[in-house]
């Protein structure tokens, strides 16, 4: 069992050109806080994983209100050392997320809100007992400086908290073959007792007591060669007549990982993958509770009140996340209907409706063409909004009463001529130029461009536009 | 502005399931989260539960093994089960709407007053 | 859960007067995740302060919230008439949420 520490020194914008703009503005004072994040082993891992070696949250640090015109200094930080519990071996090698986080303390409705400043993550190597290690880490135009260790809690010692200490038997030294436990001098270590006769070579032992077996060795005492080359079934009992002899039941029998976590086996013994808000070699450790106050922006925090049970975030509408840290852009669902309009405003969506659609989400369509006419021939389009009229040819306007001169646009390109024809407009082009609305050249070969004339049409012939 | 309104039996028999639903208007149920409190006659308000238009709910885990509470977007109402209702259920039931910025009520209904005999 | 005790039980003050009511958490009520309310006679509890000590919409500042942690405060710096009601408070950090029993303040 042990600690694992780390201490904050600096945040602030890194070197070079692109400083960051101050987080914290006179309008928008705030404050930070930071949350580191365990791993075992080197994996490359999603930041959302389970911290399986345990999280923590620090305090939070002093209002910071950035001076105008200022570059953004280092920001004040939360005073102490974020700690991590572990309560099994330190593995020597872990993977770490450091997470900065800026609480804002404004106006803004619904008191503090959070967001995420920037996120470091690496994988080290690191033997507990040893001295400080100093890290400098950048996000973005951030840079992040801390220090970190890994101590162990008596009566544990060692790189990995693992060897005891006792207090010495005799004032002056330690028992045969037993060292001082640095750096408890006046302690000695305590051997791990395996079980008896349990080989050195090839069994362990973490508990007292116990012999676990390397691999390719089983028996009891872990002194028996394991054989594959003639093995048909991965497990069972030993097969008198091939001389094979198979491990018996596997260290994940029975899952040995508690909370839901689930077991792999590994070459030494076995790994459990803990769900969200547990840690340890069994899962038996929750890293956060609802105590710690984990979620963010309005968030409540639903179960985990105490070490063996996970929490939950209820987010508020506008925000999602295991923290409820991250905010949604409620209207990237297209909530409203019809091509409505949608306005997050807060506390609430709104949808601004097109003309002939209604309904909190623009679901109604109203009944466009109820008692509504069109003149002259034409019919009422339902559906479209404002009720629509689709006009006869020759009429035009909202509804169809107005007599329609197919000309007045213009329509005719390249200096064309404009005829109003019963069946809609005809396009006398300038010469060089020919289509339904002399938009195209003809070439001075002779040959046009897209598309070639209809057959028996010359460039520059008056061209119906049907 | 958000209005709620309570509706359901005033007087439920020992051991029945008290029904009661709340009617949503001047905004959409898919906005928020809604919730039921209730008050015993002289006593300390009490937060049954709530639910979300998604379905999530949370219930009080006194009342948990109890109560039900579900929503009706087509309707803008929610509603409440409790069964197995004693005469301690006695309470003036409010529903109430969870404000967007956390987890307390900003709208109430006006109150039903429910017996238990 | 978190259990909140408001005290005093009653209170008898007289309009134009200052008070001030308590609300004390058994555990830290963290982000200052606490609301107080407003209860007259014979109606539904309204919304004064979230947040701790921000005003809810259409509250007059006469009213106003503190603290942290675990002791939070409401204020009412001049009392009115219409002031003589049954106030409660609210943690909504955690699951279950859960209310005071109330101060009663009563004219004098």
């Known amino acids: 069992a042990g600690v694992f520490e780390l201490q904050i020194h600096s945040f602030g914008p890194g070197p070079g050109p692109g400083a960051p703009r101050s987080p914290c503005s006179a309008r928008l004072p705030c404050r930070l806080f930071f949350r580191v994040c365990l791993k075992p082993g080197l994996s490359e891992e999603a930041a959302e994983s389970p911290c399986a070696l345990g999280a923590a949250l620090s305090a939070r640090g002093p209002v910071y209100t950035e001076q105008p015109g200022a570059p953004a200094p280092d920001l004040p930080l939360p005073d102490g050392l974020l700690q991590v519990p572990f309560r099994d071996a330190w593995p020597g090698t872990f993977s770490f997320i450091i997470e900065t986080w800026r609480e804002e303390l404004g106006d803004q409705i619904g008191g503090p809100a959070w967001s995420l400043l920037a996120r470091v993550a690496g994988r080290r190597r690191l033997a507990a007992g040893g001295p400080w290690a100093r890290d400098i880490q950048r996000a973005g135009a951030w840079e992040l400086r801390f220090s970190y260790r890994a101590r162990c809690e008596p009566p544990a010692v060692g790189t990995a908290c693992t060897r005891l200490c006792r207090p010495r038997s005799a004032p002056s030294r330690c028992g045969p073959g037993l060292r001082p436990c640095a750096p408890l001098e006046d302690e000695c270590e305590a051997p791990l007792v395996c079980r008896a006769g349990c080989s050195p070579e090839h069994g362990f032992c973490e508990q007292p007591g116990e012999c676990r077996c390397l691999e390719g060795w089983t028996g009891p005492l872990c002194t028996v060669p394991v054989s594959t080359s003639s093995c048909l079934s991965p497990r069972g009992p030993s097969s008198a007549t091939t001389g094979c002899l198979v491990p018996g039941p596997g260290p994940c029998d029975g899952n040995p990982c508690a909370n839901g976590g689930s077991c792999s086996e590994t070459p030494r013994s076995f790994e459990c993958t803990c769900p969200r808000g547990f840690y340890g070699l069994r899962c038996e450790v929750s890293g956060v509770t609802c105590a710690d106050g984990p979620c963010f922006n309005g968030g409540l925090c639903v179960g985990g009140a105490d070490p063996d049970s996970a929490y939950i975030c209820h987010c508020p509408p506008g925000f999602q996340g295991s923290n409820c840290e991250k905010r949604v852009d409620r209207c990237s669902l297209q909530p409203c209907r019809n091509g409505g309009l949608c306005l997050d405003l807060g506390h609430a969506l709104r949808c601004r409706c097109r003309a002939g659609f209604a309904g909190p989400r623009c679901e109604h369509d109203l009944d466009d063409c109820a008692g509504r006419a069109c003149a002259n021939g034409g019919t009422c389009v339902e559906g479209g909004g404002a009720h629509r009229c689709s006009c006869a040819l020759g009429f035009g306007g909202r509804d169809c009463r107005e007599r329609a001169d197919p000309c007045a646009a213009r329509p005719c390109a390249h200096g064309g001529r404009c005829y109003a024809h019963f069946s809609g407009l005809v396009c006398a082009c300038a010469p060089g130029y020919m289509g339904a609305r002399c938009e195209f050249p003809v070439h001075p070969d002779g040959a046009s461009a897209l598309p070639a004339a209809p057959p028996g049409l010359r460039p520059g012939d008056p061209q119906r536009y049907l | 502005q958000v209005q709620l309104q309570e509706s359901g039996p005033g007087l439920v028999k020992p051991s029945e399931t008290l029904s009661l639903t709340c009617t949503v208007s001047g905004g959409s149920i898919s906005s928020y989260y809604w919730s039921w409190i209730r008050q015993p006659p002289g006593k300390c308000l009490e937060w049954i539960g709530y639910?979300?238009?998604?379905?999530?709910?949370n219930y009080n885990p006194s009342l948990k093994s109890r109560v039900t509470i579900s929503v009706d977007t087509s309707k803008n109402q929610f509603s409440l089960k409790l069964s197995s209702v004693t005469a301690a259920d006695t309470a003036v039931y409010y529903c109430a709407s969870i404000a967007v910025t956390g987890f307390y009520f900003d709208y109430w209904g006006q109150g039903t007053l429910v017996t238990v005999s | 859960e978190i259990v909140l005790t408001q005290s005093p039980g009653t209170l008898s003050l007289s309009p134009g007067e200052r008070v001030t009511l308590s609300c004390r958490a058994s555990q830290r009520v963290n982000n200052n995740y606490l609301a107080w309310y407003q209860q007259r006679p014979g109606q539904a509890p309204r919304l004064l302060i979230y947040?701790?000590?921000s005003r809810a919409t259409g509250i007059p500042d006469r009213f106003s919230g503190s603290g942290s942690g675990t002791d939070f405060t409401l204020t009412i710096s001049r009392l009115e008439p219409e002031d003589f009601a049954v106030y409660y408070c609210q943690q909504y950090d955690r699951s279950p949420l859960t209310f005071g029993c109330g101060t009663k303040l009563e004219i004098k």
């Open positions: 947040g701790a000590s």
């Open positions: 639910v979300y238009y998604s379905g999530t709910t």
